[in-house]
Protein backbone atom coordinates (compact mmCIF):
# COMPACT_ATOMS: atom_id res chain seq x y z
CA UNK A 1 0.00 0.00 0.00
CA UNK A 2 1.57 3.30 -0.99
CA UNK A 3 1.20 6.46 1.03
CA UNK A 4 0.45 9.82 -0.52
CA UNK A 5 2.71 11.83 1.79
CA UNK A 6 6.27 12.38 0.61
CA UNK A 7 7.80 11.24 3.90
CA UNK A 8 10.91 9.39 2.80
CA UNK A 9 9.91 6.19 0.97
CA UNK A 10 6.33 5.93 -0.29
CA UNK A 11 5.38 2.27 0.08
CA UNK A 12 4.19 0.28 3.08
CA UNK A 13 4.88 -3.12 1.48
CA UNK A 14 6.47 -4.20 -1.77
CA UNK A 15 5.09 -7.17 -3.70
CA UNK A 16 6.89 -9.74 -5.84
CA UNK A 17 3.58 -10.58 -7.53
CA UNK A 18 3.26 -9.11 -11.01
CA UNK A 19 0.00 -7.40 -11.94
CA UNK A 20 -1.89 -8.08 -15.15
CA UNK A 21 -0.81 -5.33 -17.58
CA UNK A 22 -4.42 -5.13 -18.81
CA UNK A 23 -5.60 -4.17 -15.33
CA UNK A 24 -3.01 -1.38 -15.09
CA UNK A 25 -4.04 2.24 -15.32
CA UNK A 26 -0.56 3.63 -14.72
CA UNK A 27 2.92 2.45 -13.75
CA UNK A 28 5.22 4.92 -11.98
CA UNK A 29 8.90 4.35 -11.40
CA UNK A 30 10.21 6.65 -8.68
CA UNK A 31 14.02 6.77 -8.76
CA UNK A 32 16.10 6.69 -5.60
CA UNK A 33 16.56 10.16 -4.13
CA UNK A 34 17.64 11.98 -0.99
CA UNK A 35 14.19 11.19 0.43
CA UNK A 36 14.20 7.47 -0.35
CA UNK A 37 17.38 5.51 -1.02
CA UNK A 38 15.63 2.91 -3.18
CA UNK A 39 13.71 2.75 -6.44
CA UNK A 40 9.97 2.35 -5.89
CA UNK A 41 7.50 1.09 -8.50
CA UNK A 42 3.86 2.08 -8.00
CA UNK A 43 1.14 0.43 -10.04
CA UNK A 44 -2.22 2.20 -10.21
CA UNK A 45 -4.98 -0.30 -10.94
CA UNK A 46 -7.98 0.40 -13.17
CA UNK A 47 -10.28 -1.10 -10.54
CA UNK A 48 -10.97 1.62 -7.95
CA UNK A 49 -7.72 3.40 -8.83
CA UNK A 50 -5.93 1.59 -6.05
CA UNK A 51 -2.16 1.68 -5.88
CA UNK A 52 0.19 -1.25 -5.33
CA UNK A 53 3.91 -1.18 -4.71
CA UNK A 54 6.03 -3.65 -6.64
CA UNK A 55 9.45 -4.99 -5.77
CA UNK A 56 11.98 -3.67 -8.32
CA UNK A 57 14.33 -6.57 -7.47
CA UNK A 58 11.78 -9.25 -8.40
CA UNK A 59 12.34 -11.12 -11.67
CA UNK A 60 8.58 -11.18 -12.31
CA UNK A 61 8.35 -7.40 -11.87
CA UNK A 62 11.33 -6.84 -14.17
CA UNK A 63 9.53 -8.94 -16.79
CA UNK A 64 6.37 -6.88 -16.27
CA UNK A 65 8.33 -3.65 -16.85
CA UNK A 66 9.77 -5.10 -20.07
CA UNK A 67 6.30 -6.14 -21.26
CA UNK A 68 4.80 -2.71 -20.49
CA UNK A 69 7.62 -0.81 -22.21
CA UNK A 70 7.34 -3.13 -25.24
CA UNK A 71 3.59 -2.44 -25.38
CA UNK A 72 4.24 1.31 -25.17
CA UNK A 73 6.83 1.26 -27.94
CA UNK A 74 4.35 -0.62 -30.18
CA UNK A 75 1.73 2.08 -29.59
CA UNK A 76 4.00 5.07 -30.18
CA UNK A 77 4.29 6.12 -33.86
Amino acid sequence: VPLSRTVRCTCISISNQPVNPRSLEKLEIIPASQFCPRVEIIATMKKKGEKRCLNPESKAIKNLLKAVSKERSKRSP
Partner: antibody, heavy 117, light 109 residues
Framework: QVQLVESGGGVAQSGKSLRLSCAAS????????MHWVRQAPGKGLEWLAV????????YYADSVKGRFTISRDNSNNTLNLQMSSLRAEDTALYYC??????????WGKGTLVTVSS | LTQLTQPPSVSLAPGQTATITCGGD??????VHWYQQKPGQAPVLVVY???DRPSGIPERFSGSNSGNTATLTISRVEAGDEADYYC????????????FGGGTKLTVL
Protein backbone atom coordinates in the same frame (compact mmCIF):
# COMPACT_ATOMS: atom_id res chain seq x y z
CA GLN B 1 5.22 -21.21 6.34
CA VAL B 2 4.61 -17.74 7.76
CA GLN B 3 4.95 -17.54 11.53
CA LEU B 4 4.46 -14.55 13.82
CA VAL B 5 5.13 -14.98 17.54
CA GLU B 6 4.40 -12.17 19.98
CA SER B 7 6.05 -11.81 23.38
CA GLY B 8 6.48 -9.27 26.16
CA GLY B 9 2.93 -9.18 27.49
CA GLY B 10 2.15 -9.26 31.19
CA VAL B 11 0.82 -7.14 34.03
CA ALA B 12 1.84 -3.48 34.15
CA GLN B 13 0.82 -0.68 36.46
CA SER B 14 -1.14 2.29 35.16
CA GLY B 15 1.23 4.98 33.87
CA LYS B 16 4.10 2.54 33.38
CA SER B 17 5.69 1.16 30.20
CA LEU B 18 5.87 -2.19 28.45
CA ARG B 19 7.65 -3.37 25.29
CA LEU B 20 6.10 -6.00 23.03
CA SER B 21 8.00 -7.93 20.37
CA CYS B 22 7.00 -10.06 17.41
CA ALA B 23 9.38 -12.59 15.86
CA ALA B 24 8.67 -13.20 12.17
CA SER B 25 9.72 -16.12 9.97
CA UNK B 26 8.72 -17.87 6.73
CA UNK B 27 8.66 -14.78 4.49
CA UNK B 28 10.90 -11.93 3.35
CA UNK B 29 10.30 -9.71 6.37
CA UNK B 30 12.06 -6.69 4.84
CA UNK B 31 9.52 -6.53 1.96
CA UNK B 32 6.41 -6.11 4.09
CA UNK B 33 4.77 -3.53 6.30
CA MET B 34 3.81 -4.81 9.74
CA HIS B 35 0.89 -3.94 12.00
CA TRP B 36 -0.16 -4.11 15.64
CA VAL B 37 -3.84 -4.77 16.34
CA ARG B 38 -5.42 -5.27 19.76
CA GLN B 39 -8.58 -6.83 21.14
CA ALA B 40 -9.92 -5.91 24.57
CA PRO B 41 -11.61 -8.78 26.45
CA GLY B 42 -14.97 -9.56 24.82
CA LYS B 43 -14.56 -6.70 22.31
CA GLY B 44 -13.73 -6.27 18.62
CA LEU B 45 -10.48 -5.69 16.77
CA GLU B 46 -8.78 -2.30 16.99
CA TRP B 47 -5.97 -1.35 14.61
CA LEU B 48 -3.13 0.44 16.43
CA ALA B 49 -0.12 1.06 14.20
CA VAL B 50 1.71 0.19 10.99
CA UNK B 51 5.36 0.47 9.97
CA UNK B 52 6.53 0.36 6.37
CA UNK B 53 8.82 -2.35 5.01
CA UNK B 54 11.94 -0.21 5.46
CA UNK B 55 10.84 1.49 8.69
CA UNK B 56 10.65 4.95 7.13
CA UNK B 57 6.90 5.46 7.61
CA UNK B 58 4.82 4.86 10.73
CA TYR B 59 1.13 5.54 11.27
CA TYR B 60 -0.88 5.31 14.48
CA ALA B 61 -4.48 5.19 15.65
CA ASP B 62 -5.53 8.31 17.57
CA SER B 63 -6.04 6.21 20.72
CA VAL B 64 -2.30 5.45 21.00
CA LYS B 65 -0.66 8.37 19.16
CA GLY B 66 2.08 9.90 21.31
CA ARG B 67 2.08 6.99 23.76
CA PHE B 68 3.00 3.97 21.61
CA THR B 69 5.96 3.64 19.23
CA ILE B 70 6.24 0.98 16.53
CA SER B 71 9.70 -0.06 15.31
CA ARG B 72 11.36 -2.91 13.45
CA ASP B 73 14.72 -4.61 13.06
CA ASN B 74 14.97 -6.12 9.58
CA SER B 75 18.30 -7.79 10.35
CA ASN B 76 16.62 -9.82 13.11
CA ASN B 77 13.13 -10.12 11.57
CA THR B 78 11.61 -8.45 14.62
CA LEU B 79 8.74 -6.01 15.12
CA ASN B 80 8.37 -4.02 18.36
CA LEU B 81 5.75 -1.94 20.13
CA GLN B 82 6.96 0.34 22.91
CA MET B 83 3.97 1.25 25.09
CA SER B 84 4.20 4.06 27.62
CA SER B 85 1.76 5.94 29.90
CA LEU B 86 -0.36 2.78 30.02
CA ARG B 87 -4.04 3.07 30.95
CA ALA B 88 -6.61 0.55 32.16
CA GLU B 89 -8.25 0.70 28.70
CA ASP B 90 -5.02 -0.61 27.13
CA THR B 91 -5.77 -4.01 28.67
CA ALA B 92 -6.10 -6.33 25.66
CA LEU B 93 -4.67 -9.15 23.61
CA TYR B 94 -2.08 -7.62 21.25
CA TYR B 95 -1.57 -9.16 17.82
CA CYS B 96 1.13 -8.48 15.26
CA UNK B 97 0.07 -8.96 11.64
CA UNK B 98 1.67 -8.90 8.21
CA UNK B 99 0.55 -6.32 5.65
CA UNK B 100 -0.63 -7.56 2.25
CA UNK B 101 -1.39 -4.31 0.48
CA UNK B 102 -4.64 -3.55 2.30
CA UNK B 103 -5.61 -6.75 4.06
CA UNK B 104 -3.60 -8.29 6.91
CA UNK B 105 -2.92 -11.78 5.65
CA UNK B 106 -1.13 -13.44 8.58
CA TRP B 107 -1.55 -12.91 12.32
CA GLY B 108 0.28 -14.08 15.43
CA LYS B 109 -1.55 -15.75 18.32
CA GLY B 110 -1.29 -12.62 20.45
CA THR B 111 0.23 -11.59 23.78
CA LEU B 112 -1.94 -10.45 26.69
CA VAL B 113 -1.36 -7.08 28.35
CA THR B 114 -3.13 -6.31 31.63
CA VAL B 115 -2.92 -2.78 33.05
CA SER B 116 -3.72 -2.58 36.74
CA SER B 117 -4.63 0.62 38.54
CA LEU C 1 -12.52 8.66 9.24
CA THR C 2 -14.34 5.69 7.71
CA GLN C 3 -16.84 3.99 10.01
CA LEU C 4 -17.93 0.42 9.35
CA THR C 5 -21.21 -0.91 10.73
CA GLN C 6 -21.93 -4.62 11.14
CA PRO C 7 -24.94 -6.38 12.70
CA PRO C 8 -23.92 -7.73 16.12
CA SER C 9 -25.26 -11.22 15.43
CA VAL C 10 -26.60 -13.55 12.75
CA SER C 11 -28.16 -16.94 13.56
CA LEU C 12 -29.19 -19.70 11.18
CA ALA C 13 -29.44 -23.48 10.79
CA PRO C 14 -26.78 -25.67 9.14
CA GLY C 15 -27.07 -25.81 5.36
CA GLN C 16 -28.53 -22.31 5.08
CA THR C 17 -26.81 -19.28 3.54
CA ALA C 18 -25.39 -16.67 5.91
CA THR C 19 -25.22 -13.04 4.80
CA ILE C 20 -23.13 -10.66 6.89
CA THR C 21 -23.18 -7.00 5.93
CA CYS C 22 -20.69 -4.18 6.43
CA GLY C 23 -22.06 -0.67 5.97
CA GLY C 24 -20.02 2.44 5.27
CA ASP C 25 -20.27 5.68 3.35
CA UNK C 26 -19.43 4.89 -0.31
CA UNK C 27 -17.72 1.68 0.80
CA UNK C 28 -18.08 0.41 -2.77
CA UNK C 29 -15.21 2.72 -3.74
CA UNK C 30 -12.86 0.92 -1.36
CA UNK C 31 -11.57 -2.64 -1.21
CA VAL C 32 -13.11 -4.58 1.68
CA HIS C 33 -11.45 -7.49 3.48
CA TRP C 34 -13.11 -10.06 5.77
CA TYR C 35 -11.71 -12.02 8.74
CA GLN C 36 -13.02 -15.02 10.65
CA GLN C 37 -12.14 -15.33 14.33
CA LYS C 38 -13.02 -18.46 16.28
CA PRO C 39 -13.04 -18.35 20.12
CA GLY C 40 -9.52 -18.24 21.57
CA GLN C 41 -7.90 -17.99 18.13
CA ALA C 42 -6.31 -15.26 16.02
CA PRO C 43 -8.25 -13.77 13.10
CA VAL C 44 -7.94 -15.47 9.70
CA LEU C 45 -8.35 -13.63 6.38
CA VAL C 46 -11.21 -15.28 4.44
CA VAL C 47 -11.95 -12.73 1.68
CA TYR C 48 -9.81 -9.85 0.40
CA UNK C 49 -10.25 -7.11 -2.22
CA UNK C 50 -14.07 -7.50 -2.03
CA UNK C 51 -14.30 -10.88 -3.74
CA ASP C 52 -10.99 -12.79 -3.67
CA ARG C 53 -10.28 -15.81 -1.47
CA PRO C 54 -6.87 -16.71 -0.03
CA SER C 55 -5.70 -20.24 -0.80
CA GLY C 56 -7.20 -22.81 1.57
CA ILE C 57 -10.46 -20.89 2.11
CA PRO C 58 -13.49 -22.88 0.88
CA GLU C 59 -15.47 -21.65 -2.13
CA ARG C 60 -18.49 -21.41 0.18
CA PHE C 61 -17.07 -18.06 1.30
CA SER C 62 -17.68 -15.21 -1.14
CA GLY C 63 -17.88 -11.43 -1.04
CA SER C 64 -19.42 -8.51 -2.87
CA ASN C 65 -19.25 -4.75 -2.49
CA SER C 66 -21.18 -1.85 -4.01
CA GLY C 67 -22.74 1.42 -2.95
CA ASN C 68 -22.80 1.69 0.83
CA THR C 69 -22.72 -2.03 1.67
CA ALA C 70 -20.19 -4.84 1.44
CA THR C 71 -21.41 -8.40 2.00
CA LEU C 72 -19.79 -11.64 3.11
CA THR C 73 -21.82 -14.68 2.04
CA ILE C 74 -21.28 -18.15 3.47
CA SER C 75 -23.25 -20.79 1.61
CA ARG C 76 -24.17 -24.20 3.07
CA VAL C 77 -23.20 -23.07 6.56
CA GLU C 78 -21.55 -25.66 8.82
CA ALA C 79 -21.13 -25.82 12.60
CA GLY C 80 -17.41 -25.10 12.09
CA ASP C 81 -18.26 -21.70 10.57
CA GLU C 82 -19.51 -20.45 13.94
CA ALA C 83 -17.23 -17.49 14.72
CA ASP C 84 -16.94 -13.71 14.82
CA TYR C 85 -16.56 -12.05 11.41
CA TYR C 86 -14.95 -8.64 10.87
CA CYS C 87 -14.84 -6.42 7.80
CA UNK C 88 -11.91 -4.06 7.26
CA UNK C 89 -10.82 -1.30 4.88
CA UNK C 90 -7.72 0.81 4.41
CA UNK C 91 -8.60 4.48 4.85
CA UNK C 92 -6.28 7.09 3.36
CA UNK C 93 -8.63 10.07 3.53
CA UNK C 94 -7.09 12.13 6.35
CA UNK C 95 -4.34 10.06 7.88
CA UNK C 96 -3.60 6.49 6.95
CA UNK C 97 -5.45 3.95 9.05
CA UNK C 98 -6.76 0.43 8.84
CA UNK C 99 -10.37 0.34 10.04
CA PHE C 100 -12.32 -2.67 11.35
CA GLY C 101 -16.06 -3.11 11.65
CA GLY C 102 -17.45 -3.95 15.08
CA GLY C 103 -17.79 -7.65 14.25
CA THR C 104 -20.69 -10.04 13.72
CA LYS C 105 -21.18 -13.18 15.79
CA LEU C 106 -22.36 -15.99 13.52
CA THR C 107 -24.26 -18.68 15.42
CA VAL C 108 -25.09 -21.99 13.74
CA LEU C 109 -28.17 -23.37 15.50
Amino acid sequence: QVQLVESGGGVAQSGKSLRLSCAASGFTFSNYGMHWVRQAPGKGLEWLAVISYDGSNRYYADSVKGRFTISRDNSNNTLNLQMSSLRAEDTALYYCAKDAGGPLDYWGKGTLVTVSS
Amino acid sequence: LTQLTQPPSVSLAPGQTATITCGGDNIGRKSVHWYQQKPGQAPVLVVYDDTDRPSGIPERFSGSNSGNTATLTISRVEAGDEADYYCQVWDSSIDHSWVFGGGTKLTVL
